[in-house]
């Protein structure tokens, strides 16, 4: 079945936007005015995953780019990366697990937990202009809460 997708932008709970930092990395920083056009637009696809009441499995691709956020082990540590895929085959309903995030939504605040590595979350640093990463702690210094804004297709 064709996968259902929506275009959106994400900001962390400190209102930092996500922008490209080189070809395969995202960073988070405060943007204003016309600079907001730099923020990445995601295509959030609703994919198959494990059944759960409060977790919705999604994949996060970069709109009109054949890049998806994925979670892999690097030096024995769960790591967030942007992975290039064949656009003829993606997005699809049954995404490989490394591409799947469990979207957890409470009061319009979103967390994205790696399906591959439970309790590891898409995270940003308190500091400006730092890479978006996969973090293994919630409620600490690092930020794991995001807000989402829909973008016209």
């Amino acid at each position: 079945a064709p996968v259902r997708s929506l275009n959106c932008t994400l900001r962390d709970s400190q209102q930092k936007s996500l922008v490209m930092s080189g070809p395969y990395e995202l960073k988070a920083l405060h943007l204003q005015g016309q600079d907001m056009e730099q923020q990445v637009v995601f295509s959030m696809s609703f994919v198959q995953g494990e059944e759960s009441n409060d977790k919705i499995p999604v994949a996060l691709g970069l709109k009109e780019k054949n890049l998806y956020l994925s979670c892999v082990l690097k030096d024995d540590k769960p790591t967030l990366q942007l992975e290039s895929v064949d656009p003829k085959n993606y997005p699809k309903k049954k995404m490989e697990k490394r591409f799947v995030f469990n979207k957890i939504e409470i009061n319009n605040k979103l967390e994205f937990e790696s399906a591959q590595f439970p309790n590891w979350y898409i995270s940003t640093s308190q500091a400006e202009n730092m890479p978006v990463f996969l973090g293994g702690t919630k409620g600490g210094q690092d930020i794991t809460d995001f807000t989402m804004q829909f973008v016209s297709s």
Partner: antibody, heavy 120, light 107 residues
Framework: QVQLVQSGAEVKKPGASVKVSCKVS????????IEWVRQAPGKGLEWIGE????????NYNEKFKGKATITADTSTDTAYMELSSLRSEDTAVYYC?????????????WGQGTLVTVSS | DIQMTQSPSSLSASVGDRVTITCKAS??????LSWFQQKPGKAPKSLIY???RLVDGVPSRFSGSASGTDYTLTISSLQPEDFATYYC?????????FGQGTKLEIK
């Protein structure tokens, strides 16, 4: 609490158009799809299409492309469905309903329905 | 389009009976299956979504289950207010499609 209030019954002549409204309250309008469903007299339910207000996303049942046009006004939290080139077969009750943007919660809330009668 | 074949089309039962209604999907629908109750002249009322999750306020005598592409609505002990028409809906793939309906009547 969540409410979907639809416009009143309409009687139209064949070939005319009609615009049905669905005013919502009690939730964030832009985060829920508005679904449109029809039910001909004595028949079952048929899905027409959906819109996610504020996102530009609209999906139609191919059967209703060219017949139904779905729009939404985020300033008034109201969705609309316009039916064109009406024929007697379009006589039905038209319902709006809602589903959360991530499709998880089903068609939870429904409007009371709008009866559209096409008769010469 | 995905076909939802609902059975039986009508059913007579008594208060207190256990009743099951089935919908068979023509292909996998990834558990995007809802059940609705409709009474004459009224809008449908949502009972169950994602196969087995009960909508807030719906009595626990209603339950849903799945086996492969077969989906079942069970009413464990019929109450007088349960006599109505029931519909299933798949909302996995466009166009979303409803079953033909099951009219539940008093025996």
């Amino acid at each position: 609490q969540v409410q979907l209030v639809q416009s009143g019954a309409e009687v139209k002549k064949p070939g005319a158009s009609v615009k049905v409204s669905c005013k919502v309250s009690g939730y964030t309008f832009s985060r829920y799809w508005i679904e449109w469903v029809r039910q001909a007299p004595g028949k079952g339910l048929e899905w027409i299409g959906e819109i996610l207000p504020g996102s530009g996303n609209i999906n139609y049942n191919e059967k209703f492309k060219g017949k139904a046009t779905i729009t939404a006004d985020t300033s008034t939290d109201t969705a609309y469905m316009e039916l064109s080139s009406l024929r007697s077969e379009d006589t039905a009750v038209y319902y709006c309903s809602t589903i959360y943007y991530d499709y998880d919660q089903g068609f939870t809330y429904w409007g009371q329905g709008t009866l559209v009668t096409v008769s010469s | 389009d995905i076909q939802m074949t609902q059975s039986p089309s009508s059913l007579s039962a008594s208060v207190g009976d256990r009743v099951t209604i089935t919908c068979k999907a023509s292909q996998d629908i990834d558990r995007y299956l809802s059940w609705f109750q409709q009474k004459p002249g009224k809008a449908p009322k949502s009972l169950i979504y994602r196969v087995k999750r009960l909508v807030d306020g719906v009595p626990s005598r209603f339950s849903g289950s799945a086996s492969g592409t077969d989906y079942t609505l069970t009413i464990s002990s019929l109450q007088p207010e349960d006599f109505a028409t029931y519909y299933c809906l798949q909302y996995d793939e466009f166009p979303y499609t409803f079953g033909q309906g099951t009219k539940l009547e008093i025996k």
